[in-house]
């Protein structure tokens, strides 16, 4: 007799692993046999899906490879067409082992900053997330939290709060492990000692010390008057993430002096500043015609003429003093490519000594000007034809600028080492004994004011003349 | 040859005034440094000024505000003019050549202050 | 201010005896920039103005006899006489001419034995 479907074996739960075999059974008594078919969430499961496996009639349903979206409703229903059609419902859950579907980033933060490390996870079921710092289990605090998410929070990031981080899943299925990440806190450039300021006297010698830290460690730069530290010396040592710069000066000048911390943050930098001033006593004395303050000589054209490191004197009634005295050279240089090699050396070394003139200690810069015998040396014994040449065309004012008479000294207006041997400069270069003196050309007075006297001898010479050299 | 010849020199009251000279011959004046230095009976030698080819000028603590030193580089000669003066400046005034070195020394005169 | 100490204050030499006078600055008077000392030393005579002996510490001034001979460096200084000759026995002074006030030490008295 024809009899309507009755299920008698109702689905029930079933709790799956992923990848694991499922398998729902339907059973079914009818007659004729009905037909059998299955939904998930109310949709039509086909029968020619290849995941699933339909058996038995239609009885039993597989998963063959279980995957955490089969998760749902599955309801098989029988028809016959003998009375209604029957249906049955039970639900897949999915079970699934801890995994961390987006794991933890290595990330640089800067201090005082909120950072967070992610920690998103999978499974059921749902995992408990836990982070581990370095080798320990990571407290929860006021500023450390673990949110609902997985992720890590860190409010107000300190120092100490640098290391090395990894998340933990864990559920009754197993446990997973993110790969450890760093954790880098960057910290702002700071100083910690400051460059003291200073009043000293003229040619002291002054220290200014400048202690900075962050993270990445700061570079140390120093700026002088707005620029860049152009002469002294900068000792530098780093330790425990804090770096120490010396700037030693040879205090020529008044300035300001400005150490400047740096470090990068990404494509940002923070600075940290801070600044000394040198003042010199009695800076401010006025200075008449002396006007003018030392510093290390910084051109070109005197460089193989003046001592290395020498303070030449430069002159502020001039708008660029060392551009103008440096120009001043030069154009008295370019007139000397013709004289011959006796004299050029010789004179190169009286120009230079006389428009950089050397500069005395004191309370205020003074310029040393030339010996009037090295003066006289250079005019009447290395350069006698070339200096009578030159006076010739000056007379008949064959010179087409007047810059190269400020080139040329005036013997007769210099000190004389004879009478004070500590008023005037010694040119090093010119380097002869008495016995040099034969071919002298003849005096015509006999004061001391234009007599050479032997000129000391100087390791540092660069030429000599010996008495084979024709002075007529 | 240098010659540094001083005057001026005498007895004068505590409080008082006086302007010692030296005449500088034989070098030229005008491109020297030139100094005073004196010394007290039985004592030592106390530099006191220096005056350069600008006539910018320098002192002893003892005497700044009291000696103004001063240059004549067309007579050659060299001043110092000393007021309002004390017991404990009496001494043997020289006048001294030389810049970073006291080079050529007058004979002296001498200041006496006393009441 | 720069201040001059001289040692001893007063010393007795025999001729051909070698004789040292010391002098200690109180601060540098080195100077960098030429590598100078600015320290002198003076010899005064009984009776006479003062003579410049040495200048830059160790320049000897030109007539000065070869026995005279001057050292050192920074803040200390060395006058030292090689061979004393009774024409030696006076006062000598160290000074200082780095930077203004200019001061001298206390002097050494030399006497012959």
């Known amino acids: 007799l024809p009899k309507a479907p009755v299920i008698t074996t109702p689905l029930e739960t079933v709790d799956a692993l992923v990848e694991e075999v499922a398998t729902f059974m339907c059973a079914v008594e009818s007659y004729p046999q009905p037909e059998i078919s299955w939904t998930r969430n109310k949709i039509l499961i086909k029968l020619f899906d290849t995941r699933y496996s339909i058996r038995e009639n239609g009885q039993l349903l597989t998963i063959l490879s279980v995957e955490d979206s089969d998760d749902g409703i599955y309801c098989c229903t029988a028809n016959n067409g003998v009375g209604g059609a029957v249906e049955s419902c039970g639900a897949l859950q999915v079970k699934m082992k801890p995994k961390i579907t987006r794991p933890p980033i290595n990330v640089k933060i800067i201090e005082g900053l909120k950072a967070v490390l992610p920690c998103t996870t999978m499974g059921n079921p749902k995992p408990s997330v836990s982070w581990i710092k370095g080798d320990s289990p990571l407290r929860e605090n006021s500023r450390i939290a673990v949110l609902e998410s997985g992720s890590l929070r860190i409010h107000n990031v300190q120092k100490e709060d640098a290391g090395q981080y990894r998340c933990v899943a864990k559920n009754s299925l197993g446990t997973a492990y993110s790969k450890v990440v760093k954790l880098e806190v960057e910290v702002f450039a700071r100083i910690l000692r400051a460059p003291e300021s200073h009043n000293v006297t003229f040619g002291s010698f002054v220290t200014l010390h400048c202690t900075a830290t962050g993270i990445p460690v700061p570079t140390i730069t120093w700026i002088e008057n707005g620029n860049a530290v152009s002469s002294g010396s900068i000792q530098e040592s780093v330790k425990d993430r804090v770096i120490d710069s010396r700037l030693q000066l040879f205090i020529t000048k008044p300035g300001l002096y400005t150490c400047i911390a740096t470090n990068k943050h990404g494509e940002k930098f923070s600075t940290a500043k801070a600044a000394a001033t040198i003042s010199i006593a009695e800076w401010s004395k006025p200075q008449k015609d002396n006007k003018g303050y030392c510093a290390q000589y910084r051109g070109e054209v005197c460089n193989a003429v003046l001592a290395k490191d020498a303070l030449v004197f430069l002159n502020t009634s001039y708008a660029d003093p060392e551009e103008a005295q440096e120009l001043l050279v030069h154009t008295a240089w370019n007139e000397l490519k013709v004289v011959s090699p006796v004299c050029r050396p010789a004179a190169e070394a009286l120009l230079c000594n006389h428009i950089f003139q050397e500069c005395s200690p004191g309370v205020v810069p003074t310029p040393i000007p030339i010996c009037r015998e090295y003066c006289l040396a250079v005019k009447e014994l290395f350069c006698a034809k070339e200096w009578l040449v030159m006076e010739e065309k000056t007379h008949r004012g064959l010179y087409r600028s007047e810059m190269h008479l400020l080139s040329v000294p005036e013997c007769s207006k210099l000190p004389s080492m004879h009478w004070d041997p500590t008023a005037c400069a010694r040119l090093p270069h010119l380097d002869y004994n008495k016995e040099n003196l034969k071919t002298f050309p003849p005096m015509t007075s006999s004061k001391p004011s234009v007599d050479i006297p032997n000129l000391p001898s100087s390791s540092s010479s660069s030429f000599s003349v010996s008495p084979t050299y024709s002075m007529t | 040859e240098v010659q540094l010849v001083e005057s001026g020199g005498g007895l004068v009251q505590p409080g008082g005034s006086l302007s010692l000279s030296c005449v500088a011959s034989?070098?030229?004046?005008?491109?020297?440094?030139m100094n005073w230095v004196r010394q007290a009976p039985g004592k030592g030698l106390e530099w006191l000024s220096v005056?350069?080819?600008?006539?910018?000028?320098y002192y002893a603590d003892s005497v700044k505000g009291r000696f103004t030193i001063s240059r004549d580089n067309v007579k050659n000669t060299l001043y110092l003019q000393l007021n309002n003066l004390k017991p404990e400046d009496t001494a043997l005034y020289y006048c001294?050549?030389?810049?970073?070195?006291?080079?050529?020394w007058g004979q002296g005169t001498q200041v006496t202050v006393s009441s | 201010d720069i201040v001059m100490t001289q040692s001893p204050s007063s010393v007795t030499a025999s001729a051909g005896e070698r004789v040292t006078i010391n002098c200690r600055s109180s601060?540098?008077?080195?100077?960098?920039?030429?590598?100078?000392?600015?320290l002198n030393w003076y010899q005064q005579r009984l009776g006479q103005s003062p003579r410049l002996l040495i200048y830059?510490?160790?320049a000897r001034e030109s007539g000065v006899p070869d026995r005279f001979s001057g050292s050192g460096s920074t803040t200390n200084f060395t006058l030292t006489i090689s061979s004393f000759q009774p024409e030696d026995a006076a006062v000598y002074y160290c000074?200082?001419?780095?930077?203004?006030?200019?001061?001298f030490g206390s002097g050494t008295r030399l006497e012959i034995k």
């Open positions: 001294v050549l030389g810049r970073t070195a006291l080079v050529r």
């Open positions: 034989g070098f030229t004046f005008s491109l020297y440094y």
């Open positions: 005056i350069d080819t600008h006539s910018i000028a």
């Open positions: 601060q540098s008077v080195l100077y960098s920039s030429n590598q100078k000392n600015y």
């Open positions: 830059w510490a160790s």
């Open positions: 000074q200082q001419s780095y930077k203004p006030p200019y001061g």
